[in-house]
């Protein structure tokens, strides 16, 4: 168990005291408080909430709480010139228009400043043309259209259903296919679970509900106008033409009632197979264009949103460490929401608030953590992880020297079935040990550990008797800490049963219907799942900040490195002739992984035996653990993605939300059979194997005895 010399609480009760102080009723109260009005990034309401949180964190007992502001590029609809899509006839008359707003949920009819559904950062434009249905607009969907079906999207408006991959990837794919506009819609197949009523009578998406969201392809850049540097008072800003990641074609989201009207007239090719059919009563024809009687009708988009440099505010709270104040454990989650943020983000922000309160209570009783804990309420996450990224850019020198770990705290729930954890392998053992000590909130697991219910409901595909822990991808505020800076990171939330619920995310994600009542009535009436998530997130922070020896196990990295090397080798072996022709060998990578495994094993043995009372040796061993994640960072970054610098993990180039292992090699191999210059393509594969092998070997050497 944890212990700490700087406390007047009996050491073995430290963690227990912290966990016992966390209360479901408080989380409920905080969630209610945070969700009564919209808190859109860049608005006065969100600034006021930042000041409220600052004030409350001070009251809770943190040593200091500051606002950190930045002036970043945001995007808003034009209040007097609404965005919509129409069907026009041959005379140019609009014979159908999509809705301008979502019908407000009961009790919220008089709330002002509900931003209508829009795709943030869409350029302005009024393209018109034939429609092509592109399924989820994934890379493989465009391959199917262009290569197999010989359907050309050039000059067309494409309509894609939300789900499976990050919406920004959909837009990027559509742009590359030559489309001149994108319509995004929520299909009931993905956002309406069978047997559940739509809101307000259940947690399903009504036909008028629409998912908002940004459509950037930032690849970790942060503010599009100041990549790599903070958007502070003296920042040099790029011109809009040079901004990072902005889409070049108009994009707009709609609900399934409006989608029905567009899709029911579609003609052209039939869907290639059943995986292209959703649940609407339409043929899901691919197009291009409308069927016979309607062939002269076109679709026209009317997009008038504007991009504006706007001030945002992070709240940064500090609880100074008693022994190692220059070692930082960070707990961060965002505060800005698209509308009410009932789940995203306030179910997470309420948990952070309660964790801060519990830590503050212990501090008031005379306790301090061994290491400094930083608490963050990030702004403008919904606009591209901007608040966290700008703060990390501003503080990068401190973070890369002092950052021990980052724990993310966005939505606490996306379901109420079981725990979901994504983290660095360094934290596997921490998560396992912690969840064995926590009680499961699940029905049928009374008196059982969280580890047991989690393992039963979400078993590891590789190791029996263990739960699934996933790779970190992106799409949330840990990105800059993990993918750019190489700070060990993790996230935890309660999730749905992915086996039985095939819909993407949760149905009301980023809609006006994501309210306090959604959570209180349908997801977690007792707030027991929120409490469990608070215990997991808070418990991880507690251990990371308080353990004498950092709770990282480098042997778990060795295990996954071997798994990832095997996986990428098997992908490459789908091209045996080319590997022979171009002398492609993975020997260097497997050798590096073997060395890493042996050195990690020896390091772990030394970790058991060294004299923990010697502060210099203790600090040395902890520094080797802290800097191991950093050792996987390549200062040059990945090809064309300079802010994704982790060699072992990166967000997938085809889906920002998903993590990819050995991403440099993976991307070099991806679709390699379609590269016209195989010599060049296989040369890049060889280069990426070299980079990966070198990085793994270099990381291994950081664990060797120092002299």
């Amino acid at each position: 168990k944890s212990s700490n010399e700087a406390t007047n609480i009996t050491p073995k009760h430290n963690m227990k005291a912290f966990l016992d102080e966390l209360k479901a009723e408080n989380i409920k109260k905080f969630l209610y408080n945070f969700t009564q009005i919209p808190h859109l990034a860049g608005t006065e309401q969100n600034f006021q909430l930042a000041k409220q949180i600052q004030s409350q964190w001070k009251e809770f007992g943190l040593d200091s709480v500051e606002l950190a502001h930045y002036d970043v590029l945001l995007s808003y609809p034009n209040k007097t010139h609404p965005n919509y899509i129409s069907i026009i006839n041959e005379d140019g008359n609009e014979i159908f228009n999509t809705s301008l707003f979502e019908p407000p949920p009961p009790g919220y009819e008089n709330v002002s400043d509900i931003v209508p559904p829009f795709s943030a950062f869409s350029p302005q434009g009024m393209p018109e043309g034939d429609l092509v249905y592109v399924n989820y607009a994934r890379t493989e969907d465009f391959f199917k259209l262009e290569r197999d079906m010989k359907i050309n999207c050039s000059g067309k408006i494409v309509i894609a259903r939300y789900g499976k991959v990050f919406r920004g990837n959909k837009v990027k794919n559509a742009q590359l296919a030559g489309a001149k506009g994108v319509i995004l819609y929520s299909d009931p197949a993905d956002y309406f679970a069978p047997g559940v009523k739509s809101y307000p009578d259940g947690w399903n998406l009504p036909g008028g509900g629409v998912q908002r969201g940004n459509i950037l392809n930032l690849n970790g850049a942060g503010d599009p106008l100041t990549p790599g540097y903070p958007a502070n008072e003296y920042a040099y800003r790029r011109g809009i033409a040079e901004a990072v990641g902005l889409p070049s074609i108009p994009v707009h989201p709609i609900g399934y009632y409006d989608a029905q009207k567009l899709l029911e007239k579609m003609g052209g090719s039939a869907p290639p197979d059943s995986s292209w059919r959703g649940s609407l009563k339409v043929p899901y024809n691919v197009g291009p264009g409308f069927t016979g009687n309607f062939s002269t009708q076109k679709v026209k988009m009317h997009i008038h949103s504007t991009n504006e440099v706007t001030r945002i505010y992070n709240v940064i709270g500090t609880l100074r460490g008693a022994v190692e104040p220059d070692r930082y454990v960070i707990l961060g989650g965002h505060r800005d929401s698209w509308v009410f943020g009932g789940i995203d983000p306030q179910s997470g922000a309420a948990v952070v608030h309660e964790i801060v309160r519990s830590f503050g209570t212990l501090k008031k009783e005379g306790w301090r953590p061994r290491r400094t804990i930083l608490f963050a309420s990030w702004d403008a996450e919904e606009f591209g992880l901007l608040g966290s990224t700008e703060w990390a850019e501003e503080n990068s020198r401190l973070l890369q020297e002092r950052g021990v770990a980052y724990i993310n705290a966005d939505s606490s729930i996306e379901g109420n079935y079981t725990l979901r954890v994504d983290c660095t392998p360094l934290m596997y053992s921490l998560v396992h040990n912690l969840t064995k000590e926590l009680k499961s909130p699940d029905e049928g697991f009374e008196g059982k550990s969280l580890y047991e219910s989690w393992t039963k409901k979400s078993p590891s595909p590789e190791f029996s008797g263990m739960p699934r822990i996933s790779k970190l991808g992106s799409g949330n505020d840990f990105e800059v800490f993990f993918q750019r800076l190489g700070i060990a990171s993790g996230r935890a939330r309660y999730t749905k049963n992915w086996e039985t619920n095939k819909f993407s995310g949760y149905p009301l994600y980023h809609s006006v219907y994501e309210t306090y009542e959604l959570v209180e009535k349908f997801y977690d009436p007792m707030f027991k799942y929120h409490l469990t998530v608070a215990q997991v997130r808070g418990g991880m922070v507690f251990e990371l900040a308080n353990s004498i020896v950092l709770p990282f196990d480098c042997r778990d990295y060795a295990v996954v490195l071997r798994k990832y090397a095997d996986k990428i080798y098997s992908i490459s072996m789908k091209h045996p002739q080319e590997m022979k022709t171009y002398s492609v060998s993975f020997d260097s990578l497997f050798s590096a992984v073997k060395n890493f495994t042996e050195i990690a094993s020896k390091f772990s043995e030394r970790l058991q035996d060294f004299d923990k009372s010697n502060p210099i040796v203790l600090r040395m061993m902890n520094d080797q653990l802290m800097f191991l994640e950093r050792a996987f960072i390549d200062p040059l970054g990945l090809p064309d993605r300079p802010f994704y610098r982790h060699v072992i993990y990166a967000p997938s180039s085809h889906n920002k939300y998903a993590g990819e292992s050995f991403p440099g090699i993976y991307d070099a191999l991806f679709d390699i059979e379609s590269k016209v210059d195989p010599s060049k393509a296989w040369g890049e594969v060889k280069r990426q194997i070299y980079v990966a092998a070198f990085t793994v070997q270099a990381a291994a050497e950081t664990l060797s005895e120092v002299a």
């Epitope: 010989k150 050309n152 030559g178 002739q577 080319e578 022709t581 195989p678």
Partner: antibody
Amino acid sequence: EFQVVESGGGLVKPGGSLRLSCVVSGFTFSNYNMNWVRQAPAKGLEWVSSISTGSSDIYYADSVKGRFTISRDNAKNSLYLQMNSLRVEDTAVYYCARDIIGTTRDWGQGTLVTVSS
Amino acid sequence: DIQMTQSPSSLSASVGDSVTITCRASQSINNYLNWYQQKPGKAPKLLIYTASSLLSGVPSRFSGSGSGTDFTLTISGLHPEDFATYFCQQSFSTPPITFGQGTRLDIK
């Protein structure tokens, strides 16, 4: 390096048949669509036929449709062109070529088919 | 089907000269255009793909440009081994794969 070797060409009378073969090495044959392209004496290049990796998608130029049949055997790294009802205008050098999304990438040295009475 | 028209059909030049061959598509093909070189009795060899990308091993005196419907192949400073026939080919909408009729480059 890559090697594409055609065979089976020769002299045939109008109305006759020939079967061209093509064996490849240096690339993983089963990963690629394949084409036959021909070139009449002192003339330009004319695409004849394409076949997808798993033989599910097959295309022919209008000039040979109904007379020529393309096929492949991935296990043998081989591509075939069965040519029936041959005409004088089918006289050409026939090239087997790897297709990379419409780009005719690696060509064999060609095999000459002469249709003459 | 997309038609490809090359011009000129033949041209004469001397070693060291620079020459330009043009290719026009009957409709926009974005940058999906390839250039091939063919010497007598030999198979065509790919030189340039997607209008301007030089294949590994192809000398840098060869360059391509254009997008949409109009494309050019330029050889800056002819070498003796460059005298051959050059074909353009669209890979935008296939099948059918369509080639230009060829441009024969002779030594003056």
